[in-house]
Every structure is written in C-alpha cells, then in structure tokens.
C-alpha cells in the first residue's frame, strides 16, 4: 500500500489491461500496474491513469491512504461519443438534463418517476411508452379475466425520487444536486458520485461516498424462499466491520444490502442515506470516508448493461438520500 | 415533487356553503384520483369523496345531497363544496392522491361558527 | 351502515413484532377492499404505507407488510423501530365508498 518497503511485482511480466487503460508505474516506480480510472479507489500504490489527466484525491490532507481518482480541474467529458466542456449542460435525451464538472456527468430526470398503488379506479396500473410522448406515462390496464378478484399486484414501480426537491432557490443561487450514481460495483467496495452547487460559493462541486450493495462472498440466491423469485433486502444475521484498501472501519455495523432476483431482474438500493465512516490502517493512521448506508432496495428489470446505457445507469441511481 | 395544497376559509357560519380548493403538483389529475378526507377534533378520519381520474365521482352516502367534488385538469385544481354547514362539521379537511392514499396535504382547519 | 373497526392502541417493544387489523362489520375483508394503511407520526403529515392490500409505497420500509389474515386486513411491523411510533389508519373500498377505521396508537416504549 506504501511504498517504504521493498518492491515486489506479480511473476508474469506485465498485466494485460482493457482497452483504453493504460499501463503505467505504480507511484512507488517499482512494477507496472493497469491504471485507476474516473471513480475508482486510488493509493500510492495504484495510481491515476495520467493520460486521462486523473489524479488520485484523497479528500484531505490528514487521509494519503485512500482516494478516488478524479479528473483535473476544468477537464472535459466523454459522454455518448461527444466531448462536452467542464460547467457545459447538455440534453443527453429528451429525459434527463446533464451537467459536465471536471471530467464527471451528473444528470437530473426531466421526466416525473412517479408510483401508482393499485386503486379500485386504477387496479393494474403500469408505466408505458406513448407514442409522441418522451416521458412514461401510468395506464390502467383493466382486468383482462374478469374472473380475476380485486387488484393485481401493482407493475414494478420506478423508483422516484422523494424527500426534498433537487433543485431550490437559494440567495441568488439555484441550488441543484444530482441524484448519487449508481455504486460502481455490484458487490463488494465501490464508489458513487454526484455534483452539487449546494455550497457557500454556488460553485458546482463533486462529492463521492464509498458505497456496497451487497457483499460479494455472500450466496444470497439460497435464502430466497420457496415459490417466491426475488429476496429485496436480505437480513444480516450479524454486525460487520468494513474493509478499505487494508483498512477497517472502527465500529461494526448493522448495514442492510440488496439482495437477488432468480427472474433475471436486479435489486439496487432505492433509498439511501450517507454516513461518515472511520478506518483505521494497520499503520495505526485513521481516516474518516463518507460512505452510502441502504435503508430500502427494489427489484426491477432496468439491470445494468441493457440497450439504452445511460437508462440503464439512471434506474440504478439512489433516490431519496438523507444526507 | 408531489405535492397537494388546500385553501379556503377557516371560518364558515352556520347553514353557509364551505368551498375548498386542493391545488396539485408532481402529478396530473388525468392520471390520479383525488380523495377528499376530514378529521373533527380529537377523532379519526371521516372519507368524504372522490373525484376519479376520468371525472367520475363517489360520495360518502351521509353527505351526498350536500357535497359536490369538481375539477379542472389545466389549472391543477380540484373544488370541493358543502352546502348547509354545521358546527359539527368543524374539522380539518384534507385533500390526498387516489392510490393508497400515498400523498396527502397539510390540512386545512375550518371552523362553523356564528 | 359500514363500520371498519382497529385495535385502538398496541404497544410494542423496540425490535419487536406488532400486527395491527382492521375489521369490516359485514364479512370478511378481501382483496376488493383495496386495503390502505395510512400513517400519522406526531407534527407531521398523513402518507400512505400500503396500498391494494399489501403494496408497499416507495418510502415504506421493508418491515412493514400489509396481507390479509383471518378476514382482516393486517399490518404487520417486524424489527420495530423507535420511529414506527404513530396513529395507524386503515381505510377499505365497499364498491362506492370506501371507509377509515377509527386508528390504532402505536407506542414504541421507551
């Protein structure tokens, strides 16, 4: 993780990277390692990919641990095969405005992710493409069996966003936050990122927070019941601690996680709030991280890696944050 | 953001007509039904009515000669009324979203008085 | 005339198990009910928990499940939280009318 001790490389000669990353000296000059990129954790060790003018920002001057590679002021954006200016707002689609900050996009729904519970008026409601209309509007489907007594389960519904609008005035500043990302991993450790000019200057700003959906040594398939196609949020028999790059958090805790679907839908936290969490390193060094805790998750079929990817990404964002 | 917002007088005398007006947003009330609810002082909820999402209506049978439920879908708005007021109709009235009753105004208290 | 009757108070302890009912004077509650459960916590306006018998909303926790046990409608609080201390109402659909209970005080003790 540091670099007083002596270098010490993998056998093989130099690791294969993905296409697009580069290969570059880990920040001890000693072996060469595939580089970090936008939004992944960063040490010493595992630098920034330079090339893509990252550099690893650990928060504050106290942490020199563990960072979150980030792109250099004023950096542009890459999004949908056109580059964007940092500060440029754009219209990804007709549903969501985007903002670029420093190599980063964070986006708002244009479109209303409203919830409809089943009502004698609306038994079956679902979402649905008009045609002519951007946003999904509710349809009430009547009972196609009419045998069929009271109201179905309602359609999986979009996770909206609730609790305080995004968007408010403030003393000559419209203060606007995007929704936290999707956590970059499915399981285990990850990061999830937003920007927000919610600050004394109205300067638009980013935020990071580590995040874990699930943890990935966990099997949760077997606990899902009989008859039953999904298990939302899986209960945690015990208090754990978590691990950071080596380092593990001083309290335990009671976190919930989202669980798995056998149906081919996913489940992704749809209400969250953000703690700060402290690790302490072996090296005795403490450090605090603003880390993402799920109250409730939701199963849906918006799975990350469908047709459309910013749509795709958008459903796994986090709604309704505390924080 | 959904929200539902009711207005109207807080003092209304005796054989008067009270007119309440639930103001949407976040929302369409093509889409949504909107019930309209009051609880007297130091009781439960009482379920006046409801104006559906096409514009039909149901009344609570003990006030339909009295209550009319209308909208208008431009502007938002639905207006409830109730003729021939009573100092037992002294409650606070709210107006909330068909489907579970998920989003309900803050209230509006209305007193009947001479 | 239709009377939908709830347990007026429970008391729960903290992680404990509470099941609120609510009963309908002329049978046994079904899923053409449509039973809602709506929550009051003190100072703070009325929401929806579950609606069409046992439909979460969004802000529902898990741990709040609505069904149907025994011709009631149920409200079934596992893990109770300090929070969860609040007026409970249920309201059920008769065709053209629905109707509220008269409310369950939840108290989470101390």
């Known amino acids: 993780q540091n670099c007083s001790g002596p270098c010490r490389c993998p056998a093989e000669q130099a690791p294969r990277c993905p296409a697009g990353v580069s290969l570059v000296l880990d920040g001890c000059g000693c072996c060469r390692v595939c580089a970090k990129q936008l939004g992944e954790l960063c040490t010493e060790r595992d630098p920034c990919d330079p090339h893509k003018g990252l550099f690893c920002d650990f928060g504050s001057p106290a942490n020199r641990k563990i960072g979150v590679c980030t792109a250099k002021d004023g950096a542009p954006c890459i999004f949908g095969g056109t580059v964007y200016r940092s500060g440029e707002s754009f219209q990804s689609s007709c549903k969501y405005q985007c903002t670029c900050l420093d190599g980063a996009v964070g986006c708002m729904p244009l479109c209303s992710m409203d919830v409809r519970l089943p009502s004698p008026d609306c038994p079956f409601p679902r979402r649905v493409k008009l045609p002519g209309k951007c946003c999904e509007e509710w349809v009430c489907d009547e009972p196609k069996d009419q045998t069929v007594v009271g109201p179905a389960l309602a359609a999986y519904r979009l996770e909206d966003t609730f609790g305080p609008d995004p968007t408010m005035i403030r003393a000559n500043c419209l203060v606007q936050t995007t929704e936290w990302s999707a956590c970059s991993k499915t399981c285990g450790m990850g990061i999830s990122t937003r920007v927000t000019n919610d600050n004394a200057s109205c300067r638009l700003e980013k935020q990071s927070r580590l995040c874990m959906v699930r943890p990935c040594e966990a099997d949760l398939e077997e606990n899902i019941k009989k008859g039953k196609k999904c298990i939302r949020t899986p209960k945690i028999s015990k208090p754990i601690k978590f691990e950071l790059s080596g380092c593990t958090s001083v309290k335990t805790y009671r976190a919930k996680f989202c669980g798995v679907c056998t149906d081919g839908r996913c489940c992704t936290p749809h209400r969250t709030t953000t703690l700060p969490v402290e690790f302490k390193c072996p090296d005795g060094e403490v450090m605090k991280k603003n880390m993402m805790f799920i109250k409730t998750c939701a199963c849906h079929y918006n799975c990350p890696g469908d047709n459309d990817i910013f749509e795709s990404l958008y459903y796994r964002k986090m709604y309704g944050d505390m924080a | 953001e959904v929200t539902l917002k009711e207005s109207g007088p807080v003092l209304v005398k005796p054989t008067e007509t009270l007119t309440l007006t639930c103001t949407v947003s976040?929302?369409?009330?093509?889409?949504?039904?909107v019930h309209w609810i009051r609880q007297p002082p130091g009781k439960g909820l009482e379920w006046l009515g409801v104006i559906w999402r096409r514009g039909g209506t149901d009344y609570n049978a003990a006030f339909m000669s009295r209550l009319t439920i209308s909208k208008d879908t431009s502007k938002s708005q639905v207006v409830f009324t109730m003729t021939n007021m009573d100092p037992v109709d002294t409650a606070t009235y709210y107006c909330a979203r068909d489907g579970g009753f998920d989003y309900w105004g803050q209230g509006t208290t209305v007193t009947v008085s001479s | 005339e239709t009377v939908v009757t709830q347990e007026p108070s429970l008391t729960v302890s903290p992680g404990g198990t509470v099941t609120l009912t609510c009963r309908s004077s002329?049978?046994?509650?079904?899923?053409?009910?449509?039973a809602n459960w709506v929550q009051q916590k003190p100072g703070q306006a009325f929401r929806g928990l579950i609606g069409?018998?046992?439909n979460r909303a969004p802000w529902t926790p898990a741990r709040f499940s609505g069904s149907l046990l025994g011709g009631k409608a149920a409200l079934t609080l596992s893990g109770v939280q300090p929070e969860d201390e609040a007026e409970y109402y249920c309201?059920?659909?008769?065709?053209?009318?629905?109707?509220f209970g008269g409310g369950t005080k939840l108290t989470v003790l101390g």
């Open positions: 976040g929302f369409s009330l093509s889409t949504f039904g």
């Open positions: 002329i049978g046994a509650v079904t899923t053409s009910n449509y």
């Open positions: 069409g018998t046992s």
């Open positions: 309201a059920l659909w008769y065709s053209t009318h629905y109707v």
